[in-house]
Interface confidence: low
């Protein structure tokens, strides 16, 4: 990923001082990935190169909300996905019992203070078992192929970060709107495993992007907004970022 960051830098991604209000961080993702039907996959994003604090991470599949990891309230999985989505590891998301319909774009949306919102994109392709097995036989680690893949991934990261809206993170209307739009008709948030509401666990004392809404809603008010959905906590989520 160092090469990724170098490429991003080389292509002139804005790296302004924090006090200017400009967004300085970058999102690293697992890029384009494939998995076998019926199997599982881990979606991972990583925010780096910023001293902003993370308040919430949303995982979305195209126009559907999959999960939220909130600093104060912990993990929350959309009822539509609770049987097949597991929180973690870290701020990642594990998709289980994959179907071909799971093929598509997935987005990790980092709400941070004071930078604003960072969005990472992952494209998942779910392959039929035979195709996956066939593909595995031909995964020869050719340097050229790896380099090409790296360029594709980095370009995707560059585009995603560059096009991320300047809008600030965790606006109330934004969160409320997302949940109403993407969870319309859902009676409640059902936890995949019962656990008490947990505040974010500080996973790493790194100077960049740390756990914390240094911009978002407070616990009480998030409950106010999410009570429509009987918002329940799945437990702790760990916010951490490294400088890149």
């Amino acid at each position: 990923m160092r090469w990724c960051l170098l490429l991003i830098w080389a292509q002139g991604l804005r790296q302004a001082p924090l006090a200017s209000g400009m967004m300085t961080g970058t999102i690293e993702t697992t890029g384009n990935i494939s998995a076998e039907k019926g199997g599982s996959i881990i979606l991972q994003c990583h925010l780096s190169s910023t001293t902003a604090q993370v308040t919430q991470v949303n995982w979305e599949q195209q126009d559907q909300l999959l999960a939220i990891c909130n600093a104060d309230l912990g993990w929350h999985i959309s009822p539509s996905f609770k049987d097949r989505v597991a929180p973690g590891p870290g701020l990642g998301l594990t998709l289980q019992s994959l179907t071909v319909n799971d093929t598509g774009e997935y987005f990790c949306i980092y709400h941070t203070y004071p930078d604003g919102t960072y969005t990472g994109r992952i494209f998942l392709e779910v392959l039929e078992s035979s195709v996956a097995e066939h593909g595995a036989r031909f995964q020869i680690p050719l340097l050229g192929a790896m380099a090409a893949t790296l360029v594709v991934i980095c370009t995707a990261v560059i585009v995603v970060v560059a096009l991320t809206r300047k809008k600030k993170a965790l606006r109330i209307h934004s969160v409320e709107g997302d949940l109403r739009r993407k969870s319309a008709g859902q009676e409640e948030w059902s936890p995949s495993a019962p656990s008490p509401p947990g505040s974010c666990v500080q996973a790493e004392a790194a100077p960049a992007g740390l756990c914390g809404e240094q911009r978002g809603e407070d616990c009480a008010e998030l409950h106010d907004y999410f009570n429509v959905l009987s918002y329940r906590s799945l437990g702790n989520c760990s916010f951490f970022t490294e400088t890149g």
């Epitope: 006090a19 001293t51 809008k167 500080q202 740390l210 809404e213 240094q214 978002g216 407070d218």
Partner: antibody, heavy 115, light 107 residues
């Protein structure tokens, strides 16, 4: 419930130092940045800067660089504003306010600087 | 730095009347404007946050609109309890800047 409780009023002489505290309760202190706002008597509000309550890294507005210092005592969920070499124009009420929306505020600490 | 120009500086209305306060910013701030009410001897209270979003528990007679550089805060059917100073705050970029304030009085 969420509360920010600030230290009491201060009367200081020019050249002295003051340290104002802001104790947070009802939420995870290190999850939310703390802003500081100045309000001179009969005047409007002025943002002084904020401190990242996880890393302790402060950011100061231009008018508050030099004599002003934000600090933390994380174990006590407390943020501090220290003003050195006090001047008459520092006479004001100082507020701590949680994160960018400034949705929760301390009650304010009135600082009077007079010789 | 984004400067915020708030007007009027003061106004006096009869109860039941409509109040309109305007804030104009020197740069485009999308909809990153917040509105506060401050009563004497109290800290400011957030009424409306970014995106013209009314905060929980705030009466619906308060509203706001605007995007870019021009923002309007409205109180419909003003009550005597609305007597206070009102401030706008742009939270689009640092340093965050407040408007100069509007003192609302009841005739």
């Amino acid at each position: 419930q969420i509360q920010l409780v600030q230290s009491g009023p201060e009367l200081k002489k020019p050249g002295e130092t003051v340290k104002i505290s802001c104790k947070a309760s009802g939420y995870t202190f290190t999850n939310y940045g703390m802003n500081w706002v100045k309000q001179a008597p009969g005047k409007g509000l002025k943002w002084m800067g904020w401190i990242n309550t996880y890393t302790g890294e402060p950011t100061y507005a231009d008018d508050f660089k030099g004599r002003f210092a934000f600090s933390l005592e994380t174990s006590a969920s407390t943020a501090y504003l220290q003003i050195n070499n006090l001047k008459n124009e520092d006479t004001a009420t100082y507020f701590c306010a949680r994160y960018e929306y400034f949705d929760y505020w301390g009650q304010g600490t009135t600082l009077t600087v007079s010789s | 730095e984004t400067t915020v120009t708030q007007s009027p500086a003061s106004l006096s209305v009869a109860t039941g009347e409509k109040v309109t306060i305007r804030c104009i910013t020197s740069t485009d701030i999308d909809d990153d404007m917040n509105w506060y009410q401050q009563k004497p001897g109290e800290p400011p209270k957030l009424l409306i946050s970014e995106g013209n979003t009314l905060r929980p528990g705030v009466p619906s007679r308060f509203s706001s609109s605007g995007y870019g550089t021009d923002f309007v805060f409205t109180i419909e059917n003003t009550l005597s309890e609305d007597v206070a100073d009102y401030y706008c705050l742009q939270s689009d970029n640092m340093p965050y800047t407040f408007g100069g304030g509007t003192k609302l009085e009841i005739k």
